[in-house]
């Protein structure tokens, strides 16, 4: 019989009685092998992906995911209905908008179906895991001879987002950054007409509606300056 023993400290003789549990296929193993951590992100409050690193399992394992909301009307345990796969092995679960309740404690449980006692539960505050879509429709307006105003739109409740504007000229080696609150506009008071400027923006679900740490992707950049039309200085140029 070529079966195996697995122990978490290498000393199988002194610890076997404490760690061993009977497993399928006539093998013995520990029940303490940790499951991978689940990472969830709520994309623009349209859907949520909860993912894990399936490669960390010592054998190919289709881990299963269940979820519920703690102390709420939605506390019934739900099975994942839409698994994400990485090379034929489950590596995540996608939840749709109707299943997302931002301000209730989300409980997610990962389980090994080969060894049902091997499970891990995490509690998450979804309002801190929202990632908005990148800002769109960037526009530039010349307020005066030397002042530019940048505006943009977000596909979300504007008051929930803060923004980070970056700009630089073609003479600069690095970006200049400016934080912007929920108002989604930015003014650059002193513009050099001889230089070409590039602007881009990203947004974050913080601080009014949540405390998310992750920013959106950067917007497509918008350019203004020396090679913009000379005939009409109030025109803006948008380049992806």
């Amino acid at each position: 019989l070529n079966t195996t023993i697995l122990t978490p400290n290498g000393n199988e003789d002194t610890t076997a009685d404490f760690f061993l549990t009977t497993m399928p296929t006539d093998s013995l193993s520990v029940s303490t092998l940790p499951l991978p951590e689940v990472q969830c992100f709520v994309f623009n409050v349209e859907y949520m992906n909860c993912t894990w690193n399936s490669s960390s399992e010592p054998q190919p394992t289709n881990l299963t995911l269940h979820y519920w909301y703690k102390n709420s009307d939605n506390d019934k345990v739900q099975k994942c209905s839409h698994y994400l796969f990485s090379e034929e092995i489950t590596s995540g679960c996608q939840l749709q908008k109707k299943e997302i309740h931002l301000y209730q404690t989300f409980v997610v449980q990962l389980q090994d179906p080969r060894e049902p006692r091997r499970q891990a539960t995490q509690m998450l505050k979804l309002q801190n895991l929202v990632i908005p879509w990148a800002p769109e429709n960037l526009t530039l307006h010349k307020l005066s001879e030397s002042q530019l105003e940048l505006n943009w739109n977000n596909r979300f409740l504007n008051h929930c987002l803060e923004h980070l504007v970056q700009y630089r000229t073609d003479w600069d080696h690095s970006w200049t950054e400016q934080s912007v609150d929920y108002r989604h506009k930015f003014s650059l008071p002193s513009v050099d007409g001889q230089k070409r400027y590039t602007f881009r923006v990203r947004s974050r679900f913080n601080p009014l509606c949540g405390s998310a740490q992750h920013w959106s992707e950067w917007s497509h950049p918008i350019h203004w300056g020396s090679n913009t039309s000379k005939e009409n200085p109030f025109l803006f140029a948008l380049e992806a």
Epitope: T3, L33, P58
Partner: antibody
């Protein structure tokens, strides 16, 4: 590029301990997605898996029951290597011993060069 | 434990031949079957992982197929450097990792 370099004596006396080391370059012994194996090849048993170690927030060890009670695999994070100790050897343990990494899709994607071990007094 | 059975245990073939080696698992292993080539005095070398995926750097004349319990390794046009011993290995249910007994491919 991952490389595994084996070292250790090729001659062991019966009843003594066989000790081999596998030095890793291009990966970490404490990677949270790899596992590190010892395998041997003999004419009588073909390729035979002996055991493995892997790190998932703590160290884990799997051993084949064909050598259980005689085998220990030890990772050494400071030297980025892992070792095989097989005690109470008999002529049945004479074989070519290999270390190997479990990598992509749970295949053994990198192997050491092999060490021919003879058991003789 | 899952037992792996290869056939044939040895075969003779000529350069340019198409060669097929089969491997059968004692229970379903999905597509978690790997193929290795071993030459005398050398370590085994991974050829095919996950039944049909070609390992980087391996010539395209090698291919793998199968799922469940029955798998094949095919060499479409045998080259002189292909004469070696070939092993299958399951990674579906470990431990233990189990190998086939090997197929020795010789020059006719």
């Amino acid at each position: 590029q991952v490389q595994l370099q084996q070292s250790g004596p090729g001659l062991v006396k019966p009843s003594q301990t066989l000790s081999l080391t596998c030095a890793i370059s291009g990966d970490s012994v404490s990677s949270n997605i790899a596992a590190w194996n010892w395998i041997r090849l003999s004419p009588s048993r073909g390729l035979e898996w002996l055991g493995r170690t892997f790190f998932r927030s703590t160290w884990f060890y799997d051993y084949s029951l064909s050598v259980k009670g005689r085998i220990t695999i030890n990772p050494d994070t400071s030297k980025n290597q892992f070792s095989l100790h097989l005690n109470s050897v008999t002529p049945e343990d004479a074989a070519v011993y290999y270390c190997a990494r479990t990598g992509r899709r749970w295949s053994l994607d990198y192997w050491g060069q092999g060490t021919l071990v003879t058991v003789s007094s | 434990d899952i037992q792996m059975t290869q056939s044939p245990s040895s075969l003779s073939a000529s350069v340019g031949d198409r060669v097929t080696i089969t491997c059968r698992a004692s229970q379903s292993i999905s597509s978690y079957l790997n193929w290795y080539q071993q030459k005398p005095g050398k370590a085994p070398k991974l050829l095919i992982y996950a039944a049909s995926s070609l390992q980087s750097g391996v010539p395209s004349r090698f291919s793998g197929s199968g799922s469940g319990t029955d798998f094949t390794l095919t060499i479409s046009s045998l080259q002189p450097e292909d004469f070696a011993t070939y092993y299958c290995q399951q990674s579906y249910s470990t431990p233990p990792i189990t190998f086939g007994q090997g197929t020795r491919l010789e020059i006719k």
